[in-house]
């Protein structure tokens, strides 16, 4: 049982545990999200991602969540149960990122570039919101990210 992001395989992470951690904080996060018109993980970011692209894209998205979203939100959260759930999500994201080794070969340039352009769409949408709103929205959209990632899980 493992994720297969194209040539990149990830062991030891179970989708159910990610969802359970997300649900533990979902109501809190999405209740605070007042901007319902905008979406960060829009269709163009995650739709029709090829297997080869998926390794690059999931790597950049999860790194962004770890370095920008979880890190900043962690400093703003005091509720122990919420922190525990964030930690579960973050630890699993770390485990995934640590196993992803996207190829840096020249012949993969166009695939890498395509994945990067998808990521830039997400980051641009994130930067258009003020920091607090962007963090809340990014956390509220973890379900969109998990739904997409789940497509690459193989038993």
């Amino acid at each position: 049982q493992e994720f297969h992001f194209g040539p990149c395989q990830v062991k030891g992470v179970v989708p159910q545990k990610l969802w359970e951690a997300f649900w533990a904080v979902k109501d809190t996060m999405q209740a605070q999200d007042n901007i319902t018109s905008a979406r960060l993980l829009q269709q163009e970011v995650l739709q029709n991602v090829s297997d080869a692209e998926s390794c690059y894209l999931v790597h950049t998205l999860l790194e962004f969540y770890l370095k920008t979203v979880f890190k900043n939100y962690h400093n703003r959260t005091v509720e122990v149960r919420t922190l525990k759930s964030f930690s579960t999500l973050a630890n699993n994201f770390v485990l995934i990122v640590s196993q992803l080794q996207p190829s840096q070969e020249n012949e993969m340039f166009s695939i890498r570039d395509s994945a990067h352009r998808r990521f830039l769409l997400f980051r641009r949408a994130f930067k258009q919101l003020d920091v607090e709103a962007a963090l809340t929205k990014a956390l509220g959209e973890v379900d969109i990210l998990l739904t997409w990632m789940q497509k690459f899980y193989k038993l």
């Epitope: 179970v14 159910q16 969802w19 649900w23 995650l46 998990l146 739904t147 193989k154 038993l155």
Partner: antibody, heavy 119, light 108 residues
């Protein structure tokens, strides 16, 4: 061999209650999400409820929210569905199902138990 | 609420290819599952995560999912494939498992 066996079905009057059970064997019950799905006579499949591994999260279809309650006893390897305020439109075959392991994928099903709600 | 739309019936000649479709708003971003149900029996999963086959399911069953349509393909349909087929996905905004209305496959 993996087995899911439903029981507790039967006939009941409108407004009445029933408790369905699903006895699981052949796998580590506590590691999997479980579901209840029903099928009215001549109709399609209708999802009713989902419960996570430890019962920490439960979800329901709008049609049964507030009337049905899903629960599990991991020590007894058993899934339950408490059905209250039953209506004639609840008449159906009720199936329990086990997640495949990838999430939201109903990989194994019981044979079902018939519930008839009629005056 | 999220809806999955299937045509009620599809016919295919034996040993020909059958395609059963499932329409849903941006279903390509979700994981699609397919179930086979024969009369008087419980459903059986034939495809999960868009295109993956559970063990024991014949290779003639395959799946794809893109845009607004998920497709179940049966290459070289056999008489025993005659059944009802249901697609299914998870609607994360409503926290609900959603089934399509079902398609009856007739193998001529």
């Amino acid at each position: 061999e993996l087995q899911l066996v439903e029981s507790g079905g039967g006939s009941v009057q409108p407004g009445g209650s029933l408790r369905l059970s699903c006895a699981a064997s052949g796998f580590t019950f506590s590691n999997y999400w479980m579901y209840w799905v029903r099928q009215a006579p001549g109709k399609g499949l209708e999802w009713l409820s989902l419960i996570t591994t430890d019962g920490g999260s439960t979800f329901y279809a709008d049609s049964v929210k507030g009337r049905f309650t899903i629960s599990r006893d991991n020590a007894k390897n058993t899934l339950y569905l408490q059905m209250n305020s039953l209506k004639s439109e609840d008449t159906a075959v009720y199936y329990c199902a086990k997640d495949l392991g990838s999430g939201f994928s109903l990989g194994s099903w019981g044979q079902g138990t018939q519930v008839t709600v009629s005056a | 609420s999220y809806e999955l739309t299937q045509s009620p019936s599809v016919s295919v000649a034996q040993r020909q290819t059958a395609k059963i479709t499932c329409g849903g708003d941006n279903i390509g971003s979700k994981s699609a599952q397919w179930y086979q149900q024969k009369p008087g029996q419980a459903p059986v999963m034939v495809i999960y995560s868009d295109s993956r086959r559970p063990s024991g399911i014949p290779e003639r069953f395959s799946g794809s999912n893109s845009g607004n349509t998920a497709t179940l393909t049966i290459s070289g349909a056999q008489a025993e494939d005659e059944a009802d087929y249901y697609c299914q996905a998870w609607d994360s905004s409503a926290n609900a498992v959603v089934f399509g209305g079902g398609t009856h496959l007739t193998v001529l």
